[in-house]
């Protein structure tokens, strides 16, 4: 950056190199060039010469004043016009930054995605700070009183192998940057209560032509959690409002759920699950589309599958959702 140049003098910022956005600031430039009494001192911001609010303080020093500085980052340098020199002579440069102190982190959430081997902790960082802001996640065992700290710039994945202090912990987050420091409330967790089952996916749909046609949705998960509660939501693609059905599920078998839907309408389905009685849900699964037939039966699939867990037969769909390989997202 601009700070790596060889200086023939000194440049400094008041109140500081990193300051609160919207402040009035002064940038000072002092020349120390051999055999040069500067005729004029010039300031440049991001390579563009500044023309206003420059005050000469003495023979070697000048000040540039900015009112209500709102740029997150700027590179400043200053030059001198020396007698007998055709070009301006570089004095020095400095990168400056403006931003905000961190907000108090809130909505601290820690979950263990099944099979991940990690406890993932996230929080709402609040408003954008514009400057480098670090977070320290504190994890304190309620059984051993031992505390571990993890430094990060966003969320944190903590290996469950490193959580050796039993099952109950306090978690809190400290946010800090050059302009301030804040600390969240403490979250109390029990490791057994924060597991989110492996992603549920909808694999295919078929509409059976009966007196009242019915649509069967086939859905599945890799989870080995025994008691799982799930919700399936569905709506016509033209509608705004979702219908929701609830299920208590054991994924020993592929799940089959029946719906009585209007003919010749395109529907969209999603599913999500949680360990029964626990706090956190999976994010909703990818969108799965199925158009009900006018009269003839229709299958939204490329192959059929028996409904035993280890059948070995295959499933494919023509759903056009978006892929999320480890299914992280909203968990509230």
């Amino acid at each position: 950056g601009i700070t790596n140049i060889n200086c023939s003098g000194h440049i400094w910022v008041e109140p500081a190199t990193i300051f609160k956005m919207g402040m009035n600031i002064s940038i000072y430039c002092q020349a120390a060039i051999k055999n040069c009494q500067p005729r004029k001192l010039h300031f440049y911001k991001n390579g563009i010469k500044e023309r206003f609010q420059i005050t000469r303080i003495n023979k070697t020093t000048a000040r540039l004043w900015y009112k209500n500085f709102l740029e997150p980052h700027a590179s400043m340098y200053c030059t001198a016009e020396c007698p007998k020199h055709f070009q301006e002579t570089l004095i020095c440069g400095k990168d400056i930054s403006s931003g905000y102190p961190p907000d108090i982190p809130d909505e601290v959430t820690c979950v263990i995605y099944e099979y991940s081997g990690n406890m993932t902790c996230t929080w709402n960082a609040g408003k954008l700070t514009y400057i480098d802001t670090k977070y320290v996640v504190h994890v304190k065992s309620l059984e051993t009183e031992e505390e571990q700290q993890y430094l990060t710039s966003s969320y944190i994945n903590i290996s469950t192998d490193s959580l050796q202090g039993g099952k109950k912990y306090l978690v809190w987050v400290q946010a800090a940057n050059a302009l301030g420091m804040e600390e969240s409330k403490q979250l109390q967790i029990h490791l057994d209560d924060i597991v989110i089952p492996s992603a549920a996916v909808i694999s295919r749909a078929e509409t059976i032509n009966a007196t009242v046609p019915k649509t069967i949705i086939y859905w599945d998960s890799q989870t080995t959690i025994e008691k799982v509660s799930c919700e399936m939501r569905y709506k016509a693609t033209t509608n705004q409002t979702w219908n929701v059905k609830e299920f208590d599920t054991n994924f020993t078998y592929v799940q089959q759920s029946e719906f009585y839907l209007e003919p010749n309408i395109k529907y969209v389905f999603q599913v999500r699950c949680q360990e029964t009685g626990k706090r956190y849900w999976q994010p909703w699964s990818s969108l799965f589309f199925h158009k009900t037939p006018e009269t003839v039966p229709q299958v939204t699939s490329k192959a059929f599958q028996h409904d035993t867990w280890n059948s070995g037969l295959t499933v494919a769909s023509i759903s056009t959702g978006h892929l999320t390989s480890d299914n992280r997202g909203d968990i509230g």
Epitope: V201, S203, V315, A316, S317, G321, H322, L323, S325
Partner: nanobody, 121 residues
Framework: EVQLVESGGGLVQAGGSLRLSCAAS????????MYWFRQAHENQREWVAR???????TYADSVKDRFTISRDNAKNTVYLQMNSLKPGDTAVYYC???????????????RGQGTRVTVSS
């Protein structure tokens, strides 16, 4: 259509080793997570190991430091190296995979038929 075929099971003495393989074939655009599960009794499946597409691995506590999962993305194959086997490891071992069959579709779950591993004392 996607098939998963396991191989490498068999009878082994306690303390011995086996290497299981599971090859995926068919309409595959991309395989994300791949898993090994085992089932000693009906309706009692147990997760063994998981490997992500980037080869990050996690293991059940019961097999940690004894089993190693690996994969070859070019061959759409996942492996399970099982060392220091115990009679309690006796089960049918299944591989499963989160597969995208084309670039537009969400991933689907596919499962193999399983290969039997018997550990004698």
């Amino acid at each position: 259509e996607v098939q998963l075929v396991e191989s490498g099971g068999g009878l082994v003495q306690a303390g011995g080793s086996l290497r299981l393989s599971c090859a995926a074939s068919g309409s595959i655009f991309r395989i994300n997570n791949m898993y090994w599960f085992r089932q000693a009794h009906e309706n009692q499946r147990e997760w063994v190991a998981r490997i992500t597409r980037e080869s990050d691995t996690t293991y059940a506590d019961s097999v940690k430091d004894r089993f190693t999962i690996s994969r070859d993305n070019a061959k759409n194959t996942v492996y399970l190296q099982m060392n220091s086997l115990k009679p309690g490891d006796t089960a049918v071992y299944y591989c499963t995979a989160d597969v995208q069959t084309n670039s537009r579709d969400a991933q689907q779950i596919f499962r193999g038929q399983g290969t039997r591993v018997t550990v004698s004392s």
